[in-house]
Interface confidence: medium
């Protein structure tokens, strides 16, 4: 079979947006299966037409309605003949147009008067491509060959830059890059003490505007009264915007404030946020827990717990816990040092414990008291029925 590309030179140059019809003539075959190939890959679409001119002469057309850069490449047609693939002479399709940007100036954030660079690159065909830079609406410098780097000594306010690429087909304008001025960050906000214990506090906050420079750290300052002596200053890397304050004094009023810093310096401090650490849980267990059987039930008594330290705060109420070996159990909260226990089975052994609580929680449990089911009911006074151990 004789294959040839018709009506097209070995090199075909077309302007972007123009139509192209590549024609391929096949002679010497009755029913050729003509395939178009671009850069080694079969063109898998229906923009193709095959016309029988005579029994052994066919013309295949590949139609491109509006060529763009991606259509440029090496085209040929091929047919299968007796198990062998015959290919035509290739045609190189070049698509010319206004320059195409491969690199455009990017937005930047820079410190005042600091030098910086912007880059611009555009390609043809046709070459050569020259670059002209614009600062706002003012052209800066003469045409330079692509690629071009613009060196700027510094700016004192936000400024816009763009580049323009020229070739024989015309000009193309790049995106406009905005060069922003960096500034000190704004103060943080929404400062919250998220968790409190007697000696620790977790703090979280939202960063203010970063001043177009990455926030590097935040400082949490703690005092015992707003404007008082600094108790603690913690510098934390960010993100996350959280901090754990350790080794605080229980049941104490504190205030904290936060500021954050970028490369240019720190933000103003946010307003003071007051908080109070929790007091300590009671340190002592109630002593001398004992039981008195009565006709109506069981009376439990113990000695009052006196606070060991002011940080424990006021004590009370007491919490009583009892359990029986039949699985029955319960808890009771009482204000004094005496409790009347009901709802227990006198035929089973009873184990009782008591603790004293405050605003923080319950202190240690007392030694357990075992009230044996073998104790005689209603016995009041004899030592063996008033047992504490």
């Amino acid at each position: 079979a004789g294959l040839k590309l018709m009506g097209a030179p070995v090199k075909l140059t077309v302007s972007q947006g123009q139509p192209v019809k590549l024609n391929c003539s096949v002679e010497g075959m009755e029913e050729p299966d003509i395939q178009w190939v671009k850069d080694g890959a079969v063109v898998q679409n229906l923009d193709q037409l095959y016309i029988p001119v005579s029994e052994q002469h066919w013309i295949g057309f590949l139609s491109l309605k509006s060529v763009e850069r991606s259509d440029a490449g090496r085209y040929w047609c091929q047919v299968e003949d007796g198990g062998e693939t015959e290919i035509s002479q290739p045609v190189w399709l070049t698509v010319e147009g206004v320059p195409f940007f491969t690199v455009e100036p990017k937005d930047l954030a820079v410190p005042p008067n600091a030098p910086f660079q912007l880059s611009c690159e555009a390609v043809g065909p046709p070459e050569p491509v020259t670059i002209v830079w614009w600062r706002g609406t003012t052209k800066i410098g003469g045409p330079a060959p692509s690629p071009s780097v613009l060196n700027v000594t510094g700016v004192t306010q936000s400024t816009m830059f763009s580049c323009e690429a020229h070739n024989l087909k015309g000009l193309a304008s790049s995106r406009t890059a905005t060069v922003h001025l960096q500034a000190l960050p704004a103060a943080p906000f929404n400062i919250t003490v998220t968790k409190l214990s007697s000696s620790n506090a977790s703090v979280a906050w939202m960063p203010g505007a970063d001043g177009r420079a990455l926030l590097q750290s935040c400082t949490v300052q703690v005092t015992q009264a707003p404007g008082g002596w600094e108790v603690l200053a913690v510098v934390v890397p960010v993100p996350p915007f959280t901090c754990l304050l350790r080794d605080l004094v229980p049941a104490t009023n504190y205030s904290l404030r936060v500021r954050c810093a970028n490369a240019l310096g720190p933000s103003p401090y946010a307003d003071w946020v007051p908080f109070q650490t929790k007091g300590l849980a009671p340190a002592s267990a109630p002593q001398n827990l004992h039981a008195i059987r009565t006709d109506s039930g069981l009376i439990l008594e113990w000695e009052e717990v006196i606070p060991e330290a002011p940080l424990e705060g006021p004590l009370g109420p007491y919490k009583l816990s009892w359990v029986q070996d039949n699985g029955t159990q319960d808890e009771l909260t009482v204000e004094g040092t005496r409790a009347n226990l009901t709802g227990w089975d006198p035929q089973k052994d009873l184990i009782v414990r008591v603790c004293v609580s405050n605003a923080v929680g319950c202190g240690p449990w007392s030694q357990p008291l075992v009230v044996s089911s073998h104790d005689r009911a209603g016995q009041q006074g004899p030592p063996h029925s008033r047992t504490s151990w």
């Epitope: 019809k21 299966d33 923009d47 016309i51 001119v53 013309i59 057309f61 491109l64 509006s66």
Partner: antibody, heavy 125, light 108 residues
């Protein structure tokens, strides 16, 4: 003269199978593509797919892929459209279309088409 | 899947110019074809490759394409031009054809 003769109207129940045909004459069957086009009552045209008689290469529209089969018999110059299981929504007129082009001087193709008269398929229980 | 959008109807008086549009994202790269279908008849190819008139079609029919819009123009519409008109083009992938929804032309 180019002619496309389509099989007659048919009434089927849902779930039935059906094959309709389009017999070509007046040209070399293997030289051209034949398309099938659907037109539901009172509605627009829908391209279903096409086959090239020469190599029985087929292409389908996304809505019809897997629902119908397009085939051709070179010996009788006939193209076929086949359903394995008809649905009421397949009720429509089905046209076969021959795509063609000719050249004057070998470089500018002039495009033309021939349409068959259509086959009315009614699917109803 | 790819779609071509046409106005459902267009009305003109005899002798006036009728314009029927067809929009599709792939039309900047793919050719538009136009069909005329009169009531009870098979469609007829009127325009191919955006602007080429099919053999036997009167000169008052013309086609154009710009960007994502193809247009069929009938200059000096006649009563016999009353019909449904369909645009037809390749999908953006180039792997299947699509018809527009059709436009009913009324010549009052």
């Amino acid at each position: 003269e180019v002619q496309l003769v389509q099989s007659g109207a048919d009434v089927k129940k849902p779930g039935a199978s059906l094959t309709i045909s389009c017999q070509a004459s007046g040209y070399t069957f293997t030289d051209y593509w034949i398309s099938w086009v659907r037109q539901k009552p009172g509605k627009g045209l829908e391209w279903m797919g096409q086959i090239r008689g020469q190599h029985s290469s087929t292409l389908y529209g996304p809505s019809f892929q897997g629902h119908v089969t397009i085939s051709a018999d070179r010996s009788t110059a006939t193209a076929y459209l086949q359903w394995r299981s008809l649905e009421a929504s397949d009720t429509a007129m089905y046209y076969c279309v021959r795509h063609g082009a000719s050249t004057s001087g070998g470089t500018i193709p002039e495009y033309y088409q021939h349409w068959g008269p259509g086959t009315l398929v009614t699917v109803s229980s | 899947s790819y779609e071509l959008t046409q106005p459902p109807s267009v009305s003109v008086s005899p002798g006036q110019t009728a314009r029927i549009t067809c929009s599709g994202d792939a039309l900047p790269k793919k050719y538009a074809y136009w069909y005329q279908q009169k009531s009870g008849q098979a469609p007829v190819l009127v325009i191919y490759e955006d602007a080429k008139r099919s053999s036997g079609i009167p000169e008052r029919f013309s086609g154009s394409s710009s960007g994502t819009m193809a247009t069929l123009t009938i200059s000096g519409a006649q009563v016999e031009d009353e019909a449904d008109y369909y645009c037809y083009s390749l999908s953006d992938s180039g792997n299947y054809f699509v018809f527009g929804g059709g436009t009913k032309l009324t010549v009052l």
